[in-house]
């Protein structure tokens, strides 16, 4: 199943994807598409790279803002709308016979979250794997899964994608506030 990321309407969404060029600097074609990865290529391509640079972008809202030449092909979608919600495919076309690495990620775009005082912790996110709230320029913002374990700094890695999950800052936690995402 896809890892799920949350972004607020009007903010930037960040969908991580990376690989390690071998040898360094030996870049490979990558595509990002809207929709799960088909057997070949990417469906509804939003951005495509070749061995040197980004050579196809369907909108000026799609960017690779990481260090593309070091294999960071994480997708930033600027100024997201509800229509941007859905599954995205990151496909890394490593040369050779059926060497592609593919990863499906799910973007959930929500209306701006309200930060409100809460006498008790919300328990509307019960998954053992917290959903990401992505609002920053280059990476996932901090999120909270009320009622779960204490502070965690968890890194989940597969061949080319990394996800970091953080708790809210001390200031927000001390204020008794919670982010409602439901």
């Amino acid at each position: 199943s896809e890892v799920e990321y949350i972004a607020e309407v009007g903010q930037n969404a960040y969908l991580p994807c990376s690989y390690t060029p071998a040898p360094p600097g030996n870049l490979v074609p990558v595509c990002w598409g809207k929709g799960a990865c088909p057997v070949f290529d990417c469906s509804n391509v939003v951005l495509r790279t070749d061995n040197r640079d980004v050579n196809d972008r369907t909108s000026g809202r799609y960017w690779l803002k990481g260090d593309f030449h070091k294999g960071d092909v994480s997708l930033t979608i600027e100024n997201v709308t509800l229509a941007d919600s859905g599954v995205y495919c990151c496909r890394i076309q490593i040369p050779g016979i059926m060497n592609d690495e593919k990863h499906n990620v799910k973007l959930v775009v929500i209306k701006p979250a309200k930060v409100t005082p809460a006498p008790t912790l919300q328990r509307d996110l019960t998954s053992a794997f917290p959903r990401m709230l992505t609002t920053g320029e280059h990476g996932p913002a901090e999120t909270q899964t009320p009622g779960s374990l204490p502070d965690v700094n968890l890194t989940v890695s597969n061949f080319f994608c990394e996800l970091q999950i953080f708790t809210l800052t001390n200031e927000l936690r001390d204020s008794g506030a919670t982010i409602r995402t439901a």
Epitope: V28, P29, V39, F40, D41, N51, Q93, G96, M98
Partner: antibody, heavy 119, light 107 residues
């Protein structure tokens, strides 16, 4: 107008080799994944192999893996299928097919070339 | 691999009648299913892609529907040139596979 023209088919003995070509025109060849699909006489369609626009990534059906090699020459807008260790069951019309640009369907097909493997 | 089962194998109808062809997948293929038409001695021709999108130049009488495992190709009113063999293909799961075909013949 998109055109795909296959050539190179013919009669070959079991164990022999053959090289098919597919000449493309009417679209930006280097940006499209292209597949080979075959059809045995009186039978259905079977996907055989595919290659990305850059030529860097290739894909094969288990039935031909290790025997067939797909390649392309983007400077000549031509696709190839090198067929080695041919078997009777490889007898078929071979079509080249252009991907529609999203990896999920082929929007144009050539007219095919017949390969007959028989002693 | 994902097996695509087309039914019926043969459909005998008259011009002007409605044709309904089925394609069932052994596992979900999402919406990555295409329909092709093939006439004797000719190459396949794309009719429908991504389950329900009509390809360029395809008449409106052809329509596709479905998602997941069950798909339908409908020809609302058969024209003489529509009598042919129809194949479905999935490109969601490895390897790409075709159905065995449905022959639409003149009754």
């Amino acid at each position: 107008e998109v055109q795909l023209l296959e050539s190179g088919g013919g009669l070959v003995q079991p164990g022999g080799s053959l090289r098919l070509s597919c000449a493309a025109s009417g679209f930006t060849f280097r940006t499209h994944l292209i597949s080979w699909v075959r059809q045995a006489p009186g039978k259905g369609l079977e996907w055989v192999a595919a290659i990305t626009g850059s030529g860097g990534s290739t894909y094969y059906a288990d039935s031909v893996k290790g025997r067939f090699i797909i390649s392309r020459d983007n400077s000549k807008n031509t696709l190839f299928l090198q067929m080695n260790s041919l078997r009777a069951e490889d007898t078929a019309v071979y079509y080249c097919a252009k991907d529609g640009g999203s990896g999920s369907y082929d929007d144009f097909w050539g007219q095919g070339t017949l390969v007959t493997v028989s002693s | 691999e994902t097996v695509l089962t087309q039914s019926p194998v043969t459909l005998s109808l008259s011009p002007g009648e409605r044709a309904t062809l089925s394609c069932r997948a052994s596992q979900s293929v999402g919406s990555y299913l295409a329909w092709y038409q093939q006439k004797p001695g000719q190459a396949p021709r794309l009719l429908i892609y991504d389950a329900s999108n009509r390809a360029t130049g395809i008449p409106a009488r052809f329509s596709g529907s479905g998602s997941g495992t069950d798909f339908t190709l409908t020809i609302s009113s058969l024209e003489p040139e529509d009598f042919a063999v129809y194949y479905c293909q999935q490109r969601s799961n490895w390897p790409p596979t075709f159905g065995q075909g449905t022959k639409v013949e003149i009754k």
